[in-house]
Interface confidence: low
């Protein structure tokens, strides 16, 4: 008789999850010499240990501490790029501007990017059928707690000028409920961070509005200023040209507004 299994509202664990995490770890440590010392089997064991046999609505940051310890990594603190609702462009940017880093350019972010996972209380099984949805089921689920933990640590590590890419096509350009708005903003360290510089990415080709005047951006500015961090904002009117100019800075068109 098959055991009764909790049905959650969200999609189940990504297929071949253990193999994917292990393969990503091996690939990352091969590409990044400073992480060559990492034992990927230990990383997987620590990852697994954070959620296996635990109720998937009762995960804590503490559960991830062994994984955090194994994945400790130093990135240049003044070259951090945060993003909100515009992941693809942020990643395209750091693929070209190799000295800047998003969270997903670090080992732990790379391992978990676009994956879903959860277990079941009191069994060693991974649940491939369903996992808790943040809104409909519970916020303390394995995926949400993981991203909250690594995002907090990433923001805490930042210094000098921190950049954030925001999606100017969304109704809330800055969303207080996003990971950026709820975690990263509040964990930037004022004693280390001079300025948060927002890049608002425009969607429409003919959109010449100054989205830095958007009420949600003003809200972000207010939150940041109250934390004794300077704020600045720039419109990126042509994201295609922006990327092109990062790739080919000598292009004569790159001295004009992007």
């Amino acid at each position: 008789v098959p055991r009764w299994r909790q049905q959650w509202s969200g999609p189940g664990t990504t297929k071949r999850f253990p193999e994917t995490v292990l393969a990503r770890c091996v690939k990352y440590t091969e590409i990044h010499p400073e992480m060559r010392h990492v034992d990927c089997q230990s990383v997987w064991d620590a990852f697994k240990g954070a959620f296996i046999s635990k109720h998937p609505c009762n995960i804590t940051e503490e559960d991830y501490q062994p994984l955090m310890k194994l994945g400790t990594q130093t990135v240049p603190c003044n070259k951090i790029l945060l993003w909100s609702r515009i992941k693809d462009l942020a990643h395209q940017f750091t693929q070209v501007q190799r000295d800047m880093f998003t969270l997903e350019d670090t080992l732990l972010g790379y391992l978990a990017d676009d994956l879903t996972w959860c277990g079941e209380f009191n069994t060693s099984k991974i649940n491939y059928q369903s996992c808790p949805d943040w809104r409909k089921d519970c916020s303390n689920n394995p995926v949400s707690v993981f991203w909250k933990t690594v995002s907090r640590r990433f923001a805490e590590a930042a210094c000098d000028v921190v950049h954030v890419m925001l999606n100017g096509s969304r109704s809330k350009i800055f969303d207080k409920n996003s990971t950026f708005g709820s975690v990263e903003v509040h964990n930037l360290q004022p004693e280390k961070v001079q300025t948060l510089e927002a890049w608002v990415i425009h969607g429409g080709r003919e959109d010449s509005r100054d989205l830095c005047q958007d009420p949600t951006i003003k809200e972000l500015e207010s939150i940041i200023s109250k934390r004794n961090i300077q704020f600045s904002c720039k419109n990126i009117y042509r994201p295609d040209k922006f990327l092109q100019c990062v790739k080919n800075p000598e292009d004569s068109s790159c001295t004009s507004e992007i």
Partner: nanobody, 121 residues
Framework: EVQLVESGGGLVQAGGSLRLSCAIS???????MGWFRQAPGKEREFQAG????????YYADSVKGRFTISRDNTKNTLYLQMNSLKPEDTAIYYC???????????????WGQGTQVTVAS
């Protein structure tokens, strides 16, 4: 490769103004730029910085309210407007590009040759 050429230095009376320029040639898409100065017998020190992307500006306490850094991307030029000059502002002024940390004079990818500013009392 980036070349930086400063101009605009010279002799000026105390209380006067000067505008320094730094012409940038070569690779122009560089993150942070700044102005530094070195007085005789002293270390080179940060005066003002600006980020390429957003144009955020930073100043040493000694020049806040008197100096203004700006840049014109269309002319590939960095500027330093210096007002209310004092004799202690006398120094060689250097333009720097690709600052690793704004305010840290030891780490920049590119430096100009410098331009002399002398403020007479």
């Amino acid at each position: 490769e980036v070349q930086l050429v400063e101009s605009g230095g010279g002799l000026v009376q105390a209380g006067g103004s000067l505008r320094l320029s730094c012409a940038i040639s070569g690779r122009t898409f560089i993150a942070d730029m700044g102005w530094f100065r070195q007085a005789p017998g002293k270390e080179r020190e940060f005066q003002a910085g600006i980020t390429w992307f957003g144009g955020s500006t930073y100043y040493a306490d000694s020049v806040k309210g008197r100096f203004t850094i700006s840049r014109d991307n269309t002319k590939n030029t960095l500027y330093l407007q210096m007002n209310s000059l004092k004799p202690e502002d006398t120094a060689i002024y250097y333009c720097a590009a690709g600052l690793k940390r704004i305010g840290d004079q030891r780490e920049a990818d590119y430096w100009g040759q410098g331009t002399q500013v002398t403020v007479a009392s």
